[in-house]
Interface confidence: low
């Protein structure tokens, strides 16, 4: 249904002539113009008090009639000040004024909190032309109202450049209380205190707020809204809601989980994704992070040699990317390994443990008491070593590595030989007369390259000469062997 | 337990502006309204405004809007009231005062903790 | 703005007797909080939602009322009961009025 404000009732009539409140059967509008339509009416309305100082603002025309009577300042009539209707109800609100007949072309706005109001709006303005002045009725619907049509409402009209404001209509909608605030999940630590928000408007006001935990009411009597729900703790997972009471009734928020902070349940799937020598490169999948962000992992490593102290390293990391190298391991080694992550209540279990191996190391020592000589009559160097004393982790032996340099005036030439791991001499070409050759030798595995030993040098003279004497490693303290043939 | 802290005491020249402090501690600031009471020598309370610090959001005593400002810094859980353009008439004990926050606001508790007041006096 | 109106705004009662003073307010409140203060000193909550004592109030203290009319009662006037009474209200929207208090003196 919709309820009509209407002017109130005045001791004097509202326009010359029969038309509203007066308007008789046979009496029609000679032009009724209809705004873009799209809103509907209905409603109640308390009305502004009689007397009441006009706020509306007066044109006063400089014009005069025929006999030379000034013209009455022109202003709206009062109408109703403040309607007060329920949600979805129609509403349907004028204003009017009379205007004297030698003004052309006047039309009616209407506004909104002080914006036009264009476009889906149902306006409609209807004239009542008298003998000296046209009544004009401008009127203003909405089918279904809601909490935005909330405002003061104006009517404008321009004549001779001025701008006539009629007096404020104010709608207020009623309706359920509406959440402007709402409980929110969280994730807490066992019997710890938190606070819920719950808050809701009207109109109509006062809202009143009942808090329910686990569908039973937490609060006996209501609380106006906003409302402040301090729960003291809790030891078990619990679901949380407000209601929202008004004159119009009740509205219930969404419910909230409150989520009780736990250890995290421990990583799994931790896997192997790369092993050298002395590295391991593992990842994992977090387990349940227990309603708190993880902090950090712990990587545990253990030697999976029965003979082995049984000793635990301990890595730390960051919680993400879930990855990680676990450095300064032995070659050819076996090892358990675990993951734990913590969040702020603690750590969680240890993952299962996996075993994961590393790969054979390069030889950790140089071959030993190297010895170079001349052997002029097939111009050829000899070279011999013993072999290093290898750990079981350094890998079997495969050959060595020889690397000999040739200096003589103005030219270097590094040449690089390998040998097999059975030997421990070898013979390479002279490449260069009358010049130095120094020799380093590398013990050689599948895992690498060891270290060379400490260089021995020995001069190769001119083709002619024919003393010569082996040349090898040198003592201790001696730091540039050199012998001369 | 909580505290309200307030600023010494101010003598100003009319016309002047004052800022005057309220340090709070032993609960979240942030979460509680903070309001301002003037009470002028052998008179009574009169409220002037309040702010939630959370959100900077207030509410005056209209009269009030305007001579008085109030603002909070979270970081330090300090509410501050500055009150503009002083006349003979602003010569008072400024109180700041806030609820108790345990299951209601303080609309439903009233001003549980109250500041120790700040004297302001205005003299040419 | 709701405007409260105490009553009477100076009083005297001796040791022993029954004290009781008023609140008026000019429109209906939805909650009224009485405060207790001594010269020289901030105020103290007395009574808060009409007619919960606040911590460490004696129980000689008692408040009553709703809609627009409230009271504070003491059953047995004492010497430390002496003070100025404020009642304070609170609608559903600031602004929060203040009485103009009771001065309640020891005779």
């Known amino acids: 249904a919709i309820t009509e404000a209407r002017e109130e009732a005045k001791p004097y009539p509202l326009f010359p002539g029969p038309f509203p409140g007066s308007l008789q059967t046979d009496h029609t509008p000679l032009l009724s113009l209809p705004h873009a339509s799209g809103y509907q009416p209905a409603l109640m309305f308390s009305p502004t008090q009689p007397g009441r100082p006009h706020t509306g603002n007066v044109a006063i025309p400089q014009v005069t009639s025929v006999e030379s009577k000034p013209l009455p300042p022109l202003a709206f009539k009062h109408t109703v000040g403040h309607i007060i209707l329920s949600e979805h109800k129609g509403v349907k609100f004028n204003c009017s004024i009379s205007v004297p007949n030698i003004y052309q072309d006047t039309t009616i706005s209407w506004w909104k909190d002080g914006k036009e109001l264009l476009g889906a709006h149902h306006a409609i303005t209807q004239f009542y032309p008298d003998d000296e002045v046209t009544a004009i009725i401008a009127s203003f619907s909405i089918t279904s109202v809601q909490r935005s049509d909330n405002g003061s409402y104006i009517c404008k009209m321009k004549i001779n450049n001025e701008e006539i404001v009629s007096d404020p209509i104010y709608i207020e909608v009623q309706g359920l209380p509406h959440f402007t605030k709402q409980p929110e999940s969280m994730n807490v630590t066992r019997n710890t205190a938190f606070n819920l928000t719950c808050q809701a408007v009207g109109p109509p006001e006062p809202v009143n707020i009942f808090w329910v935990q686990n569908s039973s009411r937490v609060n006996e009597q209501p609380e106006k809204s906003p409302s402040v729900l301090t729960v003291p703790g809790l030891t078990e997972m619990a679901v949380f809601s407000c209601e929202a009471h008004n004159d119009k009734g009740l509205t219930v928020s969404k419910g909230v989980q409150i989520n009780i902070k736990a250890i995290p349940s421990p990583p799994t799937e931790v896997s192997i994704r790369n092993s050298t020598a002395h590295s391991i490169l593992i990842s994992w999948v977090p387990g349940f992070d227990g309603y708190s962000p993880f902090r950090n992992c712990s990587i545990q490593v253990k030697e999976a040699d029965p003979l082995s102290n049984g000793s635990v390293m301990i890595f730390n990391t960051s919680a993400l990317p879930h990855l990680y190298q676990i450095k300064q391991l032995q070659a050819l080694a076996n090892y358990s390994i675990g993951v734990s992550c913590m969040n702020e209540i603690g750590w969680s279990a240890v993952s299962p443990w996996i075993l994961a191996s590393t790969t054979e190391g390069a030889p950790s020592v140089a071959p030993l008491n190297v010895t170079v000589f001349l052997n002029e009559s097939s111009d050829n160097v000899d070279i011999r070593w013993m072999k290093p004393p290898t750990k079981q982790q350094d890998g079997e032996l495969v050959g060595y590595r020889i690397s000999h340099v040739w200096q003589s005036a103005g030219i270097s030439k590094e040449l690089l030989e390998e040998v097999g791991q059975n030997g421990s001499r070898a013979r390479i070409s002279v490449q260069v007369h009358n010049a130095t050759c120094t020799v380093r030798i590398a013990a050689v595995t599948r895992g690498g390259v060891g270290p060379f030993s400490d260089p021995v040098k020995i001069f190769i003279p001119a083709h002619g000469w024919v003393d010569y004497a082996p040349s090898s490693t040198p003592a201790p303290g001696n730091a540039d062997p050199v012998l001369i043939i | 337990q909580v505290q309200l802290q307030q600023s010494g005491p101010e003598l100003v020249k009319p016309g002047a502006s004052v800022k005057i402090s309220c340090k709070a501690s032993g609960y979240e600031f942030s979460r509680s309204w903070m309001n301002w009471v003037k009470q002028r020598p052998g008179k009574g309370l009169e409220w002037i405004g309040r702010?939630?610090?959370?959100?900077?959001?207030?509410n005056y005593k209209g009269k009030l809007k305007g001579q008085a400002t109030l603002t909070a810094d979270k970081s330090s859980s300090t509410a501050y009231m500055q009150l503009s353009s002083l006349t003979f008439e602003d010569s008072a004990v400024y109180f700041c005062?806030?609820?108790?926050?345990?299951?209601?606001?303080?609309?439903?508790?009233?001003?549980?903790?109250w500041g120790q007041g700040t004297v302001v006096t205005v003299s040419a | 703005q709701i405007v409260l109106t105490q009553s009477p705004a100076i009083m005297s009662a001796s040791p022993g007797e029954e004290v009781t003073m008023t609140c008026s307010a000019s429109?209906?409140?939805?909650?009224m909080h009485w405060y207790q203060q001594k010269s020289g000193t901030s105020p103290k909550r007395w009574i808060y939602d009409t007619s919960k004592l606040a911590s460490g109030v004696s129980g000689r203290f008692s408040g009553s009322g709703s809609g627009t009319s409230y009271s504070l009662t003491i059953s047995s006037m004492e010497a430390e009961d002496a003070a100025t009474y404020y009642c304070?209200?609170?609608?559903?929207?600031?602004?929060?009025?203040f009485g103009a208090g009771t001065k309640l003196e020891l005779k």
């Open positions: 304070q209200q609170w609608s559903s929207n600031p602004p929060i009025t």
């Open positions: 005062a806030r609820g108790g926050g345990y299951y209601y606001d303080s609309r439903y508790e009233g001003f549980v903790y």
């Open positions: 702010i939630y610090p959370g959100d900077g959001d207030t």
């Open positions: 429109s209906s409140v939805s909650y």
